[in-house]
Interface confidence: low
């Protein structure tokens, strides 16, 4: 967990003396953009608990890792939620403090409640100033539950939350109806993401067994230790008045940590410092109790005495939480005889030891070949052993040789030697070799001679367009295989470099020299052919085409359709940018025009062979629609259509075309010609009995005109299935005019 503590000074007689301090023990914390991480942020969070506006609070930075908030003018300024944010990147963490007004109607028996997933949480609001009205419970500012004022038990209103889940976490409040929100009891509920004693994705991992009231973090399994305790399992007490993950911080003032509330990263929450309790953390622990909020009992054995800050102080020859364990000589366990690391890495080396007294972090050390002694940065304490973890400074070749792990306790000492081999990551001496190239891919042989140590575990190929500032694309390949760089741009130069890796952390070597490889752009050789075309209107033409079926990927980026109007000497070009397309609708053409049409495949800027041309005559603009079309059933197989001629005709009508379709049918409509243009009625025969039909019609002069309105009519019943609709004249052949 991030080493971040939010301290609240609870000497509340004068709000102007109240302050909040956020302290980070992280390296480089709070220095902002000129150092490693973003600055510490300390602010009041008004999203849930809003207070009347007052003068702005003052933020003061004290050194690189501390920030303090002052300038509270009245008690109501203090009420609510404060947060401190620290740590960088994925470790960025928010610590929250909830402040209750000491004069509120309702006060929380306990502000912070940390519970496990699936537990029942009980929030208890104690009546401080009674009102005979209902109590409203809220969760994160939203209404949650109402309790009748008669439901107080023992002067307390209880909210029971069974089977809590992580989304139940947040700020809860209990408020008398129609009372000021500042008189509420505010609580913080923290629900760990796992059941008791478990952590990790799926909660499959077992917590280390945090001591002294430490809480197991559900994401990383580390113990978040109460203020005044340290160690992997919070097994060690700090000296009185100290806090922080390594006991590196000191409480301000002569009375130590009295009157201070400590808030730590979730899932710990807030508590008094070690040795103190009470709503304002001003009461010392009762005899036999110790730790944060005095929650722990000493129960010392074998003559041990209880210290309210650290617990049992054991006489010589005894150790353990209750002085229950006797001492014996320590021993180093299962140390590997040889370890291998890569140059310039900062590995972690573990050394495990057992003994009585139990070896602690400071009692295990690591000695390098040059005599430098390293102290462990972390220790994992288990029932049968302590494992010290050493963060080794950046390795150099001179670090190769024999290292030694040594453990010393009052029970004696032990040591083990082991060999460390420092290996040099491989660096390519030559550029990769181009084997074959296509328009959108390059086949590359990546394995080249190299300096440094093998074996080669992975080969990374980095590539990007020449002279580009964009990020490099990277492909990881098997050392023994050639690499195909795909989805490249045709006719483009690519800078390609190899990076080799050997096994282990930091095994990636420097990038090798670059080489320039250029993709091809072969001429498209496929000749399309025009499958068909049909006129969809006087200025619209639907064209479809095909390509020969050839094996392998299609060499092409799209199609170019060309329309040549010989009369006007004009060429129209239509780009179809998908090589998968096989049809296009050409619009905005000139009615009554003779066009020559062809299609060709293109690739980059190269055009393939054109299709054999087609000759298309667009009809001139057609006449207006016939008027007042009407349908009347005559029998079970005949319907009569009547209409009026179009108005304002540009010339004599050559024929009418009737469209017949079964209502709701999915098939293509049938077109029937009426070859006597002077007629204003026709009978459609051969229809099915008891069937609804749709009809519309248009006139033709040199070209087809606009459609009339659609009319609907049903044939009469009791007829036989007919062959299909006919009219005295022949069926029209309008359609594919190829």
């Amino acid at each position: 967990a991030v080493d971040l503590t939010l301290l609240a000074n609870l000497r509340l007689t004068d709000p102007q003396r109240f302050f909040l301090t956020c302290v980070s023990g992280e390296a480089g914390a709070g220095r902002g953009s000129d150092a490693w991480g973003p600055p510490l942020l300390l602010e009041k969070d008004d999203r849930i608990v809003r207070t009347p506006p007052g003068p702005p609070l003052r933020l003061a930075r004290n050194g690189s890792h501390q920030v303090t908030l002052r300038g509270f003018s009245k008690p109501s300024d203090l009420v609510g939620v404060f947060s401190c944010v620290g740590g960088a990147g994925a470790r960025r963490t928010r610590v929250i403090y909830v402040h209750n007004s000491p004069g509120a109607h309702l006060l929380p028996d306990k502000v912070t409640h940390t519970v496990n997933k699936g537990d029942t949480a009980v929030l208890s609001a104690r009546v401080h100033k009674e009102k005979q009205t209902d109590v409203i419970w809220k969760s994160n500012g939203s209404y949650f539950y109402t309790l009748d004022w008669h439901e107080a038990q023992d002067g307390r209103f209880l909210l029971q939350l069974p089977n809590v889940q992580p989304p139940s976490s947040g700020i809860y409040s209990a408020t008398y109806l129609e009372a000021s929100p500042l008189g509420s009891a505010f609580f913080r509920l923290i629900v760990r993401g796992c059941g008791a004693g478990r952590w990790g994705p799926g909660c499959t991992k077992e917590c280390p067994g945090c001591l002294h009231g430490g809480v197991c973090h559900d994401h990383d399994g580390e113990c978040v230790c109460p203020p005044g305790f340290t160690g992997t399992r919070c097994e060690q007490a700090c000296r009185e008045g100290r806090f922080g993950q390594s006991c590196q911080e000191q409480c301000p003032g002569i009375s130590g940590c009295r009157g201070l509330t400590f808030c730590l990263p979730d899932p710990y929450g807030c508590s008094c410092g070690s040795g103190w309790r009470g709503s304002q953390c001003q009461e010392a622990c009762a005899p036999g109790h110790f730790g944060a909020d005095c929650r722990l009992q000493c129960q010392c054995q074998n003559g041990g005495t209880c210290d309210r800050f650290s617990g049992c102080v054991c006489p010589s020859g005894w150790h353990g939480v209750h002085c229950e364990k006797s001492d014996r000589i320590p021993q180093i366990l299962n140390m590997a005889s040889e370890l291998e690391f890569n140059l310039e890495t900062m590995p972690r080396i573990n050394c495990a030891a057992a003994g009585n007294p139990f070896p602690v972090r400071g009692s295990i050390e690591l000695r390098k070949p040059d005599g430098t002694v390293l102290l462990s940065t972390k220790a994992i304490v288990e029932p049968e052993k302590t494992t010290a973890e050493f963060e080794v400074p950046r390795l150099v070749l001179a670090d190769s040789g024999f290292w030694e792990c040594r453990v010393s306790t009052s029970g004696g000492q032990d040591s083990r030697r082991f060999k460390v081999n420092v290996k040099v990551p491989p660096v390519p001496l030559a550029a990769p070799r181009l084997l074959t190239k296509q328009s959108r891919q390059l086949v590359v042989s990546p394995l080249v001679s190299f300096s440094g140590d093998g074996p080669i575990s992975t080969v990374r190929l980095h590539y990007r367009p020449q002279d580009s500032t964009m990020d490099w694309s990277t492909i990881v390949v098997d050392p023994s295989e050639n690499v195909t760089l795909m989805n490249l741009r045709p006719k483009t130069g690519y800078s390609v470099r190899v990076q080799l890796s050997r096994p282990g952390e930091g095994g990636e070597g420097a990038w090798g020299p670059p080489t320039l490889m250029t993709t091809d752009c072969p001429e498209p050789l496929l000749q399309p052919w025009l499958e068909g075309w049909h006129v969809e209107g006087t200025d619209r033409l639907r064209v479809s085409w095909s390509l020969p079926l050839v094996p392998g990927p299609l060499v092409g980026d799209g199609f170019l359709l060309r329309l040549w109007d010989g009369t006007r000497g004009q060429e129209r070009r239509e780009n179809v940018s998908s090589p998968q397309a096989r049809t296009a609708l050409l619009t905005g053409l000139t009615p009554g025009t003779h066009y020559q049409l062809d299609v060709q495949l293109y690739h980059c800027t190269l055009l393939g062979p054109a299709s054999p041309p087609a000759h298309v005559l667009l009809p001139p603009s057609g006449p207006p629609a016939p008027r007042h079309l009407h349908a009347q059933a005559l029998s079970d197989s005949e319907i009569q259509l009547t209409w009026k001629h179009p108005e304002a005709l540009p010339g004599p009508i050559s024929k009418y075309v009737v469209e017949v379709q079964v209502a709701g049918g999915a098939g293509d409509p049938l077109w029937i010609d009426v070859d006597r243009p002077e007629e204003t009625s026709t009978i459609i025969r051969g229809l099915n009995a008891s069937t609804r039909y749709l009809f519309r019609m248009r006139a033709s002069i040199q070209g087809l005109g606009d459609w009339s309105n659609t009319v609907e009519e049903s044939t009469l019943g009791n007829g036989l299935q007919a062959e299909g609709p006919v009219q005295e004249s022949r069926a029209a052949e309008e359609g594919l005019d190829q």
Epitope: L525, Q527, P548, L549, P551, G552
Partner: antibody
């Protein structure tokens, strides 16, 4: 019905020439890629040559390159294979084949014509 | 050119049995692979194209699988008319090549 019908096979001496024809019917010949495939007696199939619809692009197996020429006459719906410098190992049944609907594989075959190269 | 290798050369099975024929390409042909059946005295007949698509009219006891370099033709229950020679063919390059064939005979 889609049909391919080969002709022009026969007996020829080593070093001689022969021209095979394949008449297509039942489909739009000019839109399809055409191939020749052969099968020596008791042996497996061997792809020989291919030609694309316009006739502008041809491919050959290494074993016949420089000796055989594939061509087509789209107006006559006919595919040809001109075989020069014939060798004994060219003895085989020669099939013409094309792709109608199988996205690249040969789903239409002729019945084959026998070519025997022997002295 | 891409070489195609079929195995086994001969496969002896009884009617009703399951047949598995293999074909390996010397380099990747993606899924551009076809299987043909040739009965004695007859022209080849397309069974499978695109490695796994059945050609028109082919019974569903024939199935193909694989991509890249390794392919399989499976006949789930052999019928008497299935005993023939089977060829694989790649068309992933413009120079097509066939395998040497697998003869499926009655045991």
């Amino acid at each position: 019905e889609v049909q391919l019908l080969e002709s022009g096979g026969g007996l020829v001496q080593p070093g001689g020439s022969l021209r095979l024809s394949c008449a297509a019917s039942g489909f739009t010949f000019s839109q399809y890629v055409m191939r020749w495939v052969r099968q020596a007696p008791g042996k497996g199939l061997e792809w020989v040559s291919g030609i694309y619809p316009s006739g502008g692009w041809t491919t050959y197996a290494d074993s016949v390159k420089g000796r055989f020429t594939i061509s087509r006459d789209n107006s006559k719906n006919t595919l040809y294979l001109q075989m020069n410098s014939l060798r004994a190992e060219d003895t085989a049944v020669y099939y013409c084949a094309t792709v109608a609907a199988a996205a690249g594989a040969f789903d239409i075959w002729g019945q084959g014509t026998m070519v025997t190269v022997s002295s | 050119d891409i070489q195609m290798t079929q195995s086994p050369a001969t496969l002896s099975l009884s009617p009703g049995a399951r047949a598995t024929l293999s074909c390996r390409a010397s380099q990747s042909v993606s899924s551009y692979l076809a299987w043909y059946q040739q009965r004695p005295g007859q022209t080849p007949r397309l069974l499978i194209y695109g490695a796994s698509s059945r050609a028109t009219g082919i019974p569903d006891r024939f199935s193909g699988s694989g991509s890249g370099t390794d392919f399989t033709l499976t006949i789930s229950r052999l019928e008497p008319e299935d005993f023939a020679v089977y060829y694989c063919q790649q068309y992933g390059s413009s120079r097509h090549t066939f395998g040497q064939g697998t003869k499926l005979e009655i045991k």
